[in-house]
C-alpha cells in the first residue's frame, strides 16, 4: 500500500532550521533507510506530498500553513503530517490535525504550548523544546545552589517570530514549576540603547543570575555596557541562551570559539566582560552515526536540493526529523503487525510516546506526552586562551549534569556568586545595616 | 440555481450578539424578503449551511471556526460565508476565505485588523467597527477643542475575548491618525483593586479626558474611587465606552436610564461621581422599519429558535446581518445580470463596497474598503433627574455630530475641561511656576 506523509514546511526560504532544503535531504535519507530495511513497512511505499508554511514573502505564516494543511488533507488524505516548525505556523496546523485525529510529527514547534496535548493531540516533537531547557536550568540551579532568584531577559527583533519570547516562556514556566523560585522576565528591543540602559538599571535590583536570549551581537553589546556600568564583576553571571550556538560559529573542529571577538576596537573589553558570561546551547550529538549522517545530508542537500549546508547545531533539527520519521514508520509497522491500519493515528502515536530509540542523533527518548528529552551543553571561557568550551553537559533522559573531564566552571570568586546578594538586592538585610552602623560608632 | 451561504457562528451559546439564535431569525427574515421580491435572484434558491464557531465549552474558538469553515467549503463549496463575529474566530476564517476568493460577510469582527483588506480580501463588515468609533471620538475632540492629549483605559476580563482590548486598539489607532494627539492607553484587571488604585495614581499625570472600556460595574467602581480620590471634579471627564448600552439597561421606552444606580449604599456618591461621566453607545436606529423588524425578529426567535430576545442595542447586530445579507443578494443579482456567476467573489464584493442601501437599520453606507459607516450616540446626565439621555448623535456617513434639540452637554465648569491642565500635568509650565514664585515673595 501507499503511506502518504504530508509535509508543511518552508519550501522556498532556506534560513529556517526546518526549511525543506535542510529537512528534505534528511527525509530522503530516512526513506532510503526504510527501503533498505525489510523489517520496516514491508510491501509499502512511503511518499511525501509538499505544502508550504510560508507566505509570499517567504516568512512562516499562521495562514499559509493551515491552508496548505487543509489542501493536502483534501487532496491526499495523508496518514501523517511532518512539520510545521515555526511556532505560529505549527499552532493552527496542530489544532487542525488534532481535530482530524491525524498524527503530526515535527522537530520544531518548540514553544511551551505544544506540550499541552489536550489541544495538540497526536503531536509528537522529535526535536528540542523550550520547557526541556527549563529542566536543564533547574538542574543547574540545584547544582549551584541558586534556589531563590533569577532574571530572564529576552530580545524582541522584528521578523524573528518572537523566538526569544517563546524560549523564555518555556524556560520561565518550567524553572518556576521545578524550583519554586522568584523569576523576573523582561523584554528589550535589540536596536534601542534605552532598552539596554533600563535593563542595566534594573539588574542590580532584580538579579545576579541572569539569562539572556538575544542575537550574539546584542549579547555582546549588553556585556560591554554591563562592564561599563560595573556589573560584570564577580557578583554577576550572564547566561547567553544561544541554543544553536550561533555565537560560537557552530561548526565542528578545533577552531577557537571566541564569542566576544569581532576584530574591532572593543575586543579587549569584550573579552574582559565575557569572564562573567556562560553560553547554553543544544548538545551536539557525539556518536559516529551523526557525523556520517551529516556527510550524507550535506551531499544530498547540494546534489538534489541545490543547497550548501553549513556546519553547526542547526543540523540537529533535520537529523531529528530523520529520527522522528523513522520512529513514526516503526510505530506504523508495529500497528499494522497488530492488525491496525495506517489511519489509526491514536494507536500509532501511543507507540511513539514514552519510548526510546537509537537514531542518528544518538539515544532518543520521547517522553510520556510525546516530547523528546533534550540534551544541552554549558560553555564557559578558558581564562587563559579566551576560548569558550563545553564544561558541562545535561542528559535530558537521566536529567543529570555531566562534567567534561578536566574542565570546570570558571568563577572569579572561586565559587558561584549567590543568586541574592549577601545583604539583599536593596541592602535590606537588617544584619548588614547593623554592621554598617557599628562601624560608625 | 442554488446559492449556498455557509454560516459560521455560535450555534449553541446564545450570549453573543451574533449567536445563531439571534442571527438565524434575521437571516430567515432576509430570505423571506428575497422570496417576496421578484427582482432579487429570480429563479434561484438561497440555502444556508451551518457550522459552529464555538468549541466544546460553547466559547468562540480560533480552531473550531476555521475547521467549520474548511468542512463547509469541502462539503458545500458555498458562494459566500456569513460570520464569524468573534474576533479570534473571524481572523483565521477571513484569511481562509480570502485565499479561497470567497466573499465573507459579517456584522461582527469589529477589530481594527479586519480593515486591512490585503489580508482580509472580500470581507465585508455590515456592522459596526471599532475604528469607526475612532472617527466619532476624533470628531468629538475637534468639536470640544481637545487636540492634545487623551487617556484610554481598558479592562481585561477572563473569557470576554479581549473585547475591550480590541475596542481601544481601534479607537486609539484611528484617533491618533485623525488628530495627531498624544494618547496613552492602560490595561487593568476588573477584579483587582490594586489595578484601580494604580490607575487613579496615573490619571492626574496622564489625562483629563479619559475613555474607559469596562463592564458597567467596573466603571461605577472606578468612578466611586475617583470621587473618593478627588478626581471627579470639573477638571475631568470620563467616557464609558459602553457600545451596547448595557449600563443603560438597553430597552425602548421612557424608563429613566440611571447607570449609577444599584439600590445600594453607594448610589448617592455614584450619582455625584457620574456628573463627570458620559456614555458612548452605538446609535439605536430610529426608523419605523427597525421597530417592525424587531417585532418580527423576536417572534421568530421565540417560535423557531426557542429563544427569548431582550430589548437593547445588541439587536442592531442581527439587524445588520439581515441588511448585509440583502445587500449581498442584491450584488449577486446585479453580477448575474451582467453575465457574471455566483462564484465571482471579486465582482460581487466590489458591488457591495462604496455603496449605500436602505435597510431595516436605516440608511446603510459601506465604505470604499468594505466597512460600514457607523453611527454613535453620546449620553449625558440630566443634572436635575440624574437620568442619562442622548445629547448628541454622530452620523458616520456624513461624519457629523448632530445635537439632540433642547439638550446640551453638561459641564460643571460651564465649558469642557481642557485636555491638558492649565499648568501642565506636572505643573511644568514655566509661567505657572513664575506665578507660584511671586506669591512667595
Amino acid at each position: 500500500g501507499n503511506l502518504t506523509v504530508a509535509v508543511v514546511l518552508p519550501l522556498a526560504n532556506t534560513s529556517y532550521p526546518w526549511s525543506w532544503a535542510r529537512v528534505g535531504p534528511a527525509v530522503e535519507l530516512a526513506l532510503a533507510r526504510v527501503k533498505a530495511r525489510p523489517d520496516l513497512l514491508p510491501g509499502w511505499t512511503v511518499r511525501t506530498v509538499l505544502g508550504s508554511s510560508e507566505n509570499a514573502l517567504g516568512v512562516c505564516s499562521d495562514t499559509a500553513a493551515p491552508l496548505a494543511a487543509v489542501d493536502l488533507k483534501w487532496e491526499h488524505n495523508p496518514a501523517a503530517f511532518l512539520g510545521p516548525g515555526c511556532v505560529y505556523a505549527a499552532a493552527p496546523v496542530g489544532r487542525f490535525t488534532a481535530h482530524w485525529r491525524v498524527p503530526l510529527l515535527t522537530a520544531g514547534a518548540p514553544a511551551l504550548g505544544f506540550g499541552v496535548k489536550d489541544e495538540y493531540a497526536l503531536t509528537t516533537r522529535a526535536g528540542p523544546s523550550y520547557a526541556k531547557l527549563g529542566d536543564f536550568v533547574a538542574a543547574l540551579h540545584r547544582r549551584l545552589g541558586w534556589e531563590r532568584q533569577a532574571l530572564m531577559l529576552y530580545a524582541y527583533r522584528p521578523g524573528d517570530e518572537e523566538h526569544c519570547f517563546f524560549l523564555v516562556e518555556g524556560l520561565f514556566m518550567r524553572v518556576r514549576d521545578r524550583l519554586n523560585i522568584t523569576v523576573d522576565h523582561l523584554e528589550f528591543a535589540e536596536d534601542d540603547l534605552s532598552h539596554y540602559t533600563r535593563l542595566l538599571r534594573t539588574m542590580p535590583r532584580k538579579g545576579r543570575v541572569i539569562y539572556i536570549c538575544s542575537s550574539p551581537d546584542a549579547f555582546r553589546t549588553l556585556m560591554l555596557l554591563a562592564l561599563e556600568a560595573g556589573l560584570c564583576g564577580e557578583d554577576y553571571v550572564f547566561f547567553h541562551l544561544d541554543i544553536f550556538g550561533q555565537s560560537l560559529q557552530g561548526g565542528q573542529g578545533p577552531a577557537p570559539r571566541r564569542p566576544w571577538e569581532r576584530g574591532d576596537g572593543q575586543d579587549v573589553s569584550a573579552r574582559q566582560a565575557f569572564q562573567a558570561a556562560k553560553i547554553i546551547t543544544y548538545k551536539e550529538p557525539d556518536n559516529p552515526e551523526y557525523l556520517e549522517f551529516l556527510k550524507q545530508l550535506k551531499h544530498l542537500a547540494r546534489e538534489q536540493f541545490n543547497f550548501t549546508m553549513e556546519d553547526g547545531l542547526v543540523n540537529t533539527i533535520p537529523a531529528s526529523f530523520h529520527d522522528g520519521l523513522l520512529l513514526y514508520i516503526q510505530a506504523v509497522t508495529e500497528t499494522l503487525a497488530h492488525g491496525g491500519t495506517v489511519t489509526d493515528g491514536e494507536n500509532i502515536t501511543q507507540r511513539m510516546w514514552n519510548r526510546s530509540f537509537q537514531g542518528v542523533t544518538g539515544y532518543l527518548k520521547i517522553d510520556s506526552s510525546g516530547d523528546r528529552e533534550t540534551d544541552f551543553s554549558l560553555w564557559d571561557m578558558d581564562p587563559e586562551t579566551g576560548a569558550f568550551r563545553v564544561v558541562l553537559n545535561y542528559n535530558g533522559t537521566s536529567q543529570e549534569l555531566v562534567a567534561v573531564s578536566g574542565r570546570k566552571l570558571n568563577w572569579p570568586l572561586g565559587y558561584p556568586p549567590p543568586d541574592i546578594p549577601k545583604c539583599g538586592f536593596d541592602n535590606e538585610d537588617p544584619a548588614c545595616n547593623q554592621d554598617h552602623l557599628s562601624t560608625l560608632e | 440555481g442554488n446559492l449556498t451561504v455557509a454560516v459560521v457562528l455560535p450555534l449553541a451559546n446564545t450570549s453573543y450578539p451574533w449567536s445563531w439564535a439571534r442571527v438565524g431569525p434575521a437571516v430567515e427574515l432576509a430570505l423571506a424578503r428575497v422570496k417576496a421580491r421578484p427582482d432579487l435572484l429570480p429563479g434561484w434558491t438561497v440555502r444556508t449551511v451551518l457550522g459552529s464557531s464555538e468549541n466544546a465549552l460553547g466559547v468562540c474558538s480560533d480552531t473550531a471556526a476555521p475547521l467549520a469553515a474548511v468542512d463547509l467549503k469541502w462539503e458545500h463549496n458555498p458562494a459566500a460565508f456569513l460570520g464569524p463575529g468573534c474576533v479570534y474566530a473571524a481572523a483565521p476564517v477571513g484569511r481562509f476565505t480570502a485565499h479561497w476568493r470567497v466573499p465573507l460577510l459579517t456584522a461582527g469582527a469589529p477589530a481594527l485588523g479586519f480593515g486591512v483588506k490585503d489580508e482580509y480580501a472580500l470581507t465585508t463588515r455590515a456592522g459596526p467597527s471599532y475604528a469607526k468609533l475612532g472617527d466619532f471620538v476624533a470628531a468629538l475632540h475637534r468639536r470640544l477643542g481637545w487636540e492634545r492629549q487623551a487617556l484610554m483605559l481598558y479592562a481585561y476580563r477572563p473569557g470576554d475575548e479581549e473585547h475591550c482590548f480590541f475596542l481601544v486598539e481601534g479607537l486609539f489607532m484611528r484617533v491618533r491618525d485623525r488628530l495627531n494627539i498624544t494618547v496613552d492607553h492602560l490595561e487593568f484587571a476588573e477584579d483587582d483593586l490594586s489595578h484601580y488604585t494604580r490607575l487613579l495614581r496615573t490619571m492626574p499625570r496622564k489625562g483629563r479626558v479619559i475613555y474607559i472600556c469596562s463592564s458597567p460595574d467596573a466603571f461605577r467602581t472606578l468612578m466611586l474611587l475617583a470621587l473618593e480620590a478627588g478626581l471627579c471634579g470639573e477638571d475631568y471627564v470620563f467616557f464609558h465606552l459602553d457600545i451596547f448600552g448595557q449600563s443603560l439597561q438597553g430597552g425602548q421606552g421612557p424608563a429613566p436610564r440611571r447607570p449609577w444606580e444599584r439600590g445600594d449604599g453607594q448610589d448617592v456618591s455614584a450619582r455625584q461621581a457620574f456628573q463627570a461621566a458620559k456614555i458612548i453607545t452605538y446609535k439605536e436606529p430610529d426608523n419605523p422599519e427597525y421597530l417592525e423588524f424587531l417585532k418580527q425578529l423576536k417572534h421568530l426567535a421565540r417560535e423557531q429558535f426557542n429563544f427569548t430576545m431582550e430589548d437593547g442595542l445588541v439587536n442592531t447586530i442581527p439587524a445588520s446581518f439581515h441588511d448585509g445579507l440583502l445587500l449581498y443578494i442584491q450584488a449577486v443579482t446585479e453580477t448575474l445580470a451582467h453575465g457574471g456567476t455566483v462564484t465571482d467573489g471579486e465582482n460581487i464584493t466590489q458591488r457591495m463596497w462604496n455603496r449605500s442601501f436602505q435597510g431595516v437599520t436605516g440608511y446603510l453606507k459601506i465604505d470604499s474598503s468594505g466597512d460600514r459607516e457607523t453611527d454613535f450616540s453620546l449620553w449625558d446626565m440630566d443634572p436635575e433627574t440624574g437620568a442619562f439621555r442622548v445629547v448628541l448623535n454622530y452620523n458616520g456617513t456624513s461624519q457629523e455630530l448632530v445635537a439632540v434639540s433642547g439638550r446640551k452637554l453638561n459641564w460643571p465648569l460651564g465649558y469642557p475641561p481642557p485636555d491638558i491642565p492649565k499648568c501642565g500635568f506636572d505643573n511644568e509650565d514655566p509661567a505657572c511656576n513664575q506665578d507660584h514664585l511671586s506669591t512667595l515673595e
Epitope: D191, S194, T197, L200, L225, Q266 | -
Partner: antibody, heavy 119, light 107 residues
C-alpha cells in the same frame, strides 16, 4: 517625537567662553548617550565630545581636550557643553546628537547652534 | 584614532542612476558603521546603522553593506531629492570619526 534644540551660540572673542545647551524632548537623556558634533561652515563633520547613558564615561576629541566640559542635567532633560579658551578655528555649527553607542549610533540630530569666534 | 576614508569625494550622476559610495576604516570596526545624508543648511540625517540596517522612515532604495574595514552605501535609483552630501561614521570606539564626505551632484 524626538527633538533636540540647541542654544547658547553666538559671537565670542578669542580666549572667551560659551556654554551651549541642548533641550531634549520625546525621550529621556539618561536612557541614552549624548554627543556634540561640530561642522565648520562648508566643511565636514567632527565629533568633539560624548557622555554615556549613566554619566560614568566622558569622552573628548583631542582637538578640544582640556578646553571643553560636557555635562547633563537629567531633571531638565538637557545636555550642556562648556567651552573655554575659544579659538578662531572653533567657529562652527555645534550639533547636539543622541548617541546609541554600539546600537544605532548617532541617530537624532539637533539643527545646531552657531558659534563664531572673532575679534 | 580610527581614520575613515570615503571615496569618491564627489560624484556626478543622473536621476534613475544607481550609485555606490565606499568607506574604509583604518582598523576593524565590525559593523559599527553609520551613513548620513546632509543637505545644505540642514542637520545630517541618519540613513543606515550597523552597516546595513535602515533607520526607520528611510526608503529602501538606500542600502548598506560591509563589515570589518570596507563598507559601501548604494542608492538604487536616484531621485532629485537624493542629491546631497553623504558621510560615513564609525561608532565602535571613541573618539567617533567621520569620513570626509561625498558630494553627490546632478550631472
Amino acid at each position: 517625537e524626538v527633538q533636540l534644540v540647541e542654544s547658547g551660540g553666538g559671537v565670542v572673542r578669542p580666549g572667551g567662553s560659551l556654554r551651549l545647551s541642548c533641550a531634549a524632548s520625546g525621550f529621556n537623556v539618561d536612557d541614552y548617550g549624548m554627543s556634540w558634533v561640530r561642522q565648520i561652515p562648508g566643511k565636514g563633520l567632527e565629533w568633539i565630545s560624548g557622555i554615556n547613558w549613566n554619566g560614568g564615561r566622558i569622552y573628548y576629541a583631542d582637538s578640544m581636550k582640556g578646553r571643553i566640559t560636557i555635562s547633563r542635567d537629567n531633571a531638565k532633560n538637557s545636555l550642556y557643553l562648556q567651552m573655554n579658551s575659544l579659538r578662531a578655528e572653533d567657529t562652527a555649527l555645534y550639533h547636539c546628537v543622541r548617541d546609541q553607542w554600539l546600537v544605532r549610533g548617532l541617530d537624532y540630530w539637533g539643527q545646531g547652534t552657531l558659534v563664531t569666534v572673532s575679534s | 584614532d580610527i581614520q575613515m576614508t570615503q571615496s569618491p569625494s564627489s560624484l556626478s550622476a543622473s536621476v534613475g542612476d544607481r550609485v555606490t559610495i565606499t568607506c574604509r576604516a583604518s582598523q576593524g570596526i565590525y559593523n559599527y558603521l553609520a551613513w548620513f545624508q546632509q543637505k545644505p543648511g540642514k542637520a545630517p540625517k541618519s540613513l543606515i546603522y550597523a552597516a546595513s540596517s535602515l533607520q526607520s522612515g528611510v526608503p529602501s532604495k538606500f542600502s548598506g553593506s560591509g563589515s570589518g574595514t570596507d563598507f559601501t552605501l548604494t542608492i538604487s535609483s536616484l531621485q532629485p531629492e537624493d542629491f546631497a552630501t553623504y558621510y560615513c561614521q564609525q561608532y565602535n570606539t571613541y573618539p567617533y570619526t567621520f569620513g570626509q564626505g561625498t558630494k553627490l551632484e546632478i550631472k
